[in-house]
């Protein structure tokens, strides 16, 4: 983060725990001001790596419901529908933050975590590694 | 979120701003316990819908870098190296939650915010309309 | 105001299929996932499973896996449950429900319900 | 699949009397949720997460519980509380609904 001398609108916090510990309002705003209707909706089908989606729910993370890929072959698709294992279908991961229930169950206290989800696949060409 | 008979080792909360403004400890935990070297990180070249990471900063969120991939073609990366414009390369995306200064410049007052990245990217077979 | 509006009522004969739709209004919809369950008359309730708008994500209760599809367009905020195979103990009112993904005030709970259609599976 | 059992399956009830209906799980769960149905309506939520009102829920109404046993209570019966309640579970796959408990106005 930034460390900015203090406006005199921003709520106080003491400096022992600065900036360890912030406010944060949960009221989500949201940037994506158009629903994209594309979004990835339908490419999990559609790709020659395709994946399904797993829900992956715990209500004492923030939020509480993730939908994880995890790729249907090891190979890709070929036009033909068959799958050629020349080539790889691999999970694109990414590393998100979530909010942390901590102490656990309380209602208004949490903490950053960092957590690494599948969001989707893609057909790579396979490291190939020679044999002298 | 859950609300269980409030801990005596909750933090307490007014009512009047709960649960919507809450305490979050920045201390990251990272539950990824080994950093897999692997992770995505050359995916975006040996894909056959390869992609760039343009780096995106800005200091009143948190994360402050954000890295977004861009699909390099249109169509997808045959075998011999050319692209084939009868797919397509799309990209995956997945909406992520940040936290943005609010009031702007303060240092210890967040608002979670909700953000689309484009994470990385999948050939795709395009979607034919036909005329009739 | 949060709105979940679902088609109206169908007679099939068994082994047919049906696809019931559930047109969101009042909110996000790639914000909430949407659930369906279904009623038999005179009965309990019965939860057929759940899709994700926003990625297209599914998962169904086993008991109807592979006679179920469920599906979301975006662009009009609009989801599907398709049933195929039917049989005439398919025959039930069939919900469509919202649950939250994310926070703002939100239960984390199915807190709106759309009017429900009935499905009747009659030779 | 986590069975919920509630009890009683049917209970008629006088006016201001205090309600209790019981929802037993087959296997621990984290939370429960109830919901209300009317004859000829759609369910309605009631209580989320074990203990905590529906937006328009009277006051007479409570939950609690852990576990494998939960609770809903009516601390004084109204006659527009004649309705079917139902317990559902969200910690496990499928998520299963109890077989509902009627509760009839005498």
């Known amino acids: 983060g930034i460390a900015i001398p203090r406006n005199s609108g921003c709520p106080n916090s003491e400096d022992k725990n600065f900036p360890r510990t912030v406010m944060v309002n949960l009221n989500i705003h949201n940037r994506n001001t158009s629903t994209n209707p594309k979004r990835s909706s339908d490419y999990y089908n559609r790709s020659t790596s395709p994946w399904n989606l797993h829900r992956n729910e715990d209500p004492e993370r923030y939020p509480s419901v993730i939908w994880e890929a995890k790729c249907r072959h090891l190979g890709c698709v070929k036009a033909d529908g068959n799958v050629d294992y020349h080539m790889n279908s691999v999970p694109i991961q990414q590393e998100i933050l979530v909010l942390r229930r901590e102490p656990r169950h309380c209602p208004n206290s949490f903490r950053l975590e960092k957590i690494l989800v599948s969001v989707g696949c893609t057909c790579v060409t396979p490291i190939v590694h020679h044999v002298a | 979120g859950i609300a269980i008979p409030r801990n005596s080792g909750c933090p307490n909360s007014e009512d009047k701003n709960f649960p919507r403004t809450v305490m979050v400890n920045l201390n990251i935990h990272n539950r990824n316990t080994s950093t897999n070297p692997k992770r995505s990180s050359d995916y975006y070249n040996r894909s056959t819908s390869p992609w760039n990471l343009h780096r995106n900063e800005d200091p009143e969120r948190y994360p402050s870098v954000i890295w977004e991939a861009k699909c390099r073609h249109l169509g997808c990366v045959k075998a011999d190296g050319n692209v084939d414009y009868h797919m397509n390369s799309v990209p995956i995306q997945q909406e992520i939650l940040v936290l943005r200064r609010e009031p702007r410049h303060c240092p210890n007052s967040f608002r979670l915010e909700k953000i689309l990245v484009s994470v990385g990217c999948t050939c795709v077979t395009p979607i034919v309309h036909h005329v009739a | 105001e949060v709105q979940l509006v679902q088609s109206g009522a169908e007679v099939k004969k068994p082994g047919a299929s049906v696809k019931v739709s559930c047109k969101a209004s009042g909110y996000t919809f790639t914000d909430y996932e949407v659930h369906w369950v279904r009623q038999a008359p005179g009965q309990g309730l019965e939860w057929i499973g759940v899709i994700d708008p926003g990625t297209g994500g599914v998962a169904y209760n086993q008991k109807f896996e592979g006679r179920v599809t469920m599906t979301a367009d975006t662009s009009t905020s609009t989801a599907y449950m398709e049933l195929r195979s039917l049989r005439s103990d398919d025959t039930a009112v069939y919900y469509c429900?919202?649950?939250?993904?994310?926070?703002?005030?939100?239960?984390?709970?199915?807190?709106?319900w759309g009017q429900g259609t009935l499905v009747t599976v009659s030779s | 699949e986590i069975v919920l059992t509630q009890s009683p399956d049917f209970q008629s009830v006088t006016p201001k009397e205090k309600v209790t209906i019981t929802c037993s799980a087959s296997?621990?769960?984290?939370?429960m949720h109830w919901f209300q149905q009317k004859p000829d309506q759609s369910p309605k939520l009631w209580i989320y997460r074990t203990s905590n009102l529906a937006s328009g829920v009277p006051s007479r109404f409570s939950g609690s519980g852990s576990g494998t046993d939960y609770t809903l209570t009516i601390n004084s019966l109204e006659a527009e509380d004649a309705a079917t309640y139902y317990c559902q579970q969200r910690s496990s796959y499928p998520w299963t609904f109890g077989q509902g408990t009627k509760l009839e106005i005498k």
């Open positions: 296997s621990s769960v984290n939370y």
């Open positions: 429900t919202r649950y939250s993904l994310f926070y703002g005030s939100s239960p984390y709970a199915m807190d709106y």
